[in-house]
């Protein structure tokens, strides 16, 4: 492993379309890609009038997006469906939306899911 | 072992519009982007565009823009790439392929376009 | 973004060298470790060999290694062998923030 850089494992898992997906709804999932490529977590959700919808979280393939982020943070403005991705073990666990805007300050709104 | 199998060749009529899928296996759907590339005859790569398999975001190349529609479909291990108002030129080798470094490509799909 | 410059055609006698360019932007090969390398023999789909600059795919024999320099990198192949033959491509990452783009690609001739 590269010193400073937390290695992938393991993910929480998490699929709102469980019974459809046929998957379990929540879980911890093991991280599988190419042996020389890196691992990320990542986790999707919505904002339904201020309420937040997990949709899915587990483990992401090699993706620059990714690299180095400890925290999982959307940083895309407004969003259909928000996204993160992160490095390092459960760090899906948490998620954020903090919108990189050009003129205005932009505002964390940190979400931590309730357990189904 | 990961796979990515395309829909067979098409041939269209110009301004018609053509949609090719792309169903993966060996790896979970979910987990990365789905990049569509073409190659003309007798010409290189060309970058199309790019699915977030989970989310659904999509990012289209200037050039395609308005004409091009990426989609996935989870529940299938499925994407598909819509092209609109064909015209000859569009006639190309259509390619998927995983993930924001394309390690693993589909066999394409020839889309010829012609009166 | 515009496409990446590499050369029409290189070629080499086996068990030698060549090198391949790929010459961007400050903004892009630059300043990103984002550019793959890819083979494709004709009629056929193409094969990742070289992903983030220097790093190997799976099963890419280890003659095949990538490196960058200022805006340009570069894609060496030592020890040529016939079925090196092919046209090579380099391209940039695609997803999330990054748009892609490849270079023109270029012929390998093994003489």
């Known amino acids: 492993a590269i010193l400073g850089r937390s290695e992938t494992q393991e993910c929480l898992f998490f699929n709102a379309n469980w019974e459809k997906d046929r998957t379990n709804q929540t879980g911890v999932e093991p991280c599988y890609g190419d042996k020389d490529k890196r691992r990320h977590c990542f986790a999707t959700w919505k904002n339904i009038s201020g309420s937040i919808e997990i949709v899915k979280q587990g483990c992401w393939l090699d993706d620059i997006n990714c690299y180095d982020r400890t925290d999982c943070v959307e940083k895309k403005d407004s969003p259909e469906v928000y996204f993160c991705c992160c490095e390092g073990n459960m760090c899906n666990e948490k998620f954020s939306y903090f919108p990189e805007m050009e003129v205005t300050q932009p505002t964390s709104n940190p979400v931590t899911p309730k357990p189904p | 072992q990961v796979q990515l199998v395309q829909s067979g060749a098409e041939v269209k009529k110009p301004g018609s519009s053509v949609k090719v899928s792309c169903k993966a296996s060996?790896?979970?759907?979910?987990?990365?982007?789905i990049n569509w590339v073409r190659q003309a005859p007798g010409q290189g790569l060309e970058w199309m565009g790019t699915i977030n398999a989970v989310s659904g975001s999509t990012s289209y190349a200037q050039k395609f823009q308005g004409r091009v529609t990426i989609t996935a479909d989870t529940s299938t291990s499925t994407a598909y790439m819509e092209l609109s108002s064909l015209r000859s030129e569009d006639t190309a080798v259509y390619y998927c392929?995983?993930?924001?470094?394309?390690?693993?490509w589909g066999q394409g799909t020839l889309v010829t376009v012609s009166s | 973004q515009s496409a990446l410059t590499q050369p029409r055609s290189v070629s080499g006698s086996p068990g030698q060298s060549v090198t391949i360019s790929c010459t961007g932007t400050?903004?892009?090969?630059?300043?990103?470790?984002?550019v793959n390398w890819y083979q494709q023999h004709p009629g056929k789909a193409p094969k990742l060999m070289i992903y983030g600059v220097s790093k190997r795919h799976s099963g890419v024999p280890d003659r095949f290694s990538g490196s960058k320099s200022g805006n340009t990198a570069s894609l060496t192949i030592s020890g040529l062998q016939a079925e090196d033959e092919a046209d090579y491509y380099c391209?940039?990452?695609?997803?999330?923030?990054?748009?892609?783009?490849f270079g023109g690609g270029t012929k390998l001739t093994v003489l």
């Open positions: 060996g790896y979970k759907f979910t987990s990365s982007y």
């Open positions: 392929a995983r993930g924001g470094w394309f390690d693993y």
């Open positions: 391209g940039t990452f695609a997803g999330g923030k990054y748009y892609g783009v």
């Open positions: 400050s903004s892009d090969v630059g300043s990103k470790n984002y």
